[in-house]
């Protein structure tokens, strides 16, 4: 899977959208790597 910063950001945005935004406060692009997915 793509693990560039931009890919990580878009994947996280999708995850946040699907979860209704209910995630940990530190679950932001600069804190998570591609392995978080």
């Amino acid at each position: 899977a793509c693990d560039t910063a931009t890919c990580v950001t878009h994947r996280l945005a999708g995850l946040l959208s699907r979860s209704g935004g209910v995630v940990k406060n530190n679950f932001v692009p600069t804190n998570v790597g591609s392995k978080a997915f």
């Epitope: 793509c2 910063a5 890919c7 950001t9 878009h10 996280l12 945005a13 692009p29 600069t30 804190n31």
Partner: antibody, heavy 119, light 107 residues
Amino acid sequence: EVQLQQSGPELVKPGASVRISCKASGYTFTDYYMNWVRQSHRKSLEWIGDINPNNGGTNYNQKFKGKATLTVDKSSSTAYMELRSLTSEDSAVYYCASIIIVPNYFDYWGQGTTLTVSS
Amino acid sequence: DIVMTQSQKFMSTSVGDRVSVTCKASQNVDTNVAWFQQRPGQSPKALIYSASYRYSGVPDRFTGSGSGTDFTLTISNVQSEDLADYFCQQYNNYPYTFGGGTKLEIE
């Protein structure tokens, strides 16, 4: 409102260095990567690199290694790009850009900084 | 580096028409492609990410499609404000790379 406010135009001599700033507001600066892009007539848009404001980690386009250095100042939510050993080939418009998720999911760009290298 | 080729440097269209801007990647980039619009004298503005997803606020006249190596930005019902340069970008691999741009001219 998310904003990326860049420093003003620069006119510098060949061989000199310059530092361009990009002040972020309206979102949590340390949450999102900051990208830097160059636009010149010759080469269209070129990605220079990105920086993680949270830890200072960087990814550079190999072409710009040794030319550009990316840094941040978390206390002022400002990203910087230093360009060194400037030549006329470095004359271009330089942009900072960041994909933000909160408060609005969008790819925001600064207004651009025009760099002119001339003797 | 991955080369993004926009073979048409200029495209001419009329208000109300439909136009397609194409972009070809030199290797597979999955759907990790964005499209940008740059009006004269302005910064690039993001339109599309992940090949086919519109950012909020982008008119639904703009549609992205494609995967792998071939990508298309289609503008339906072209408006005069669509006069601009359009760039594709891949972010599947470092360094991110952009196409050379397609200038849309309104007749």
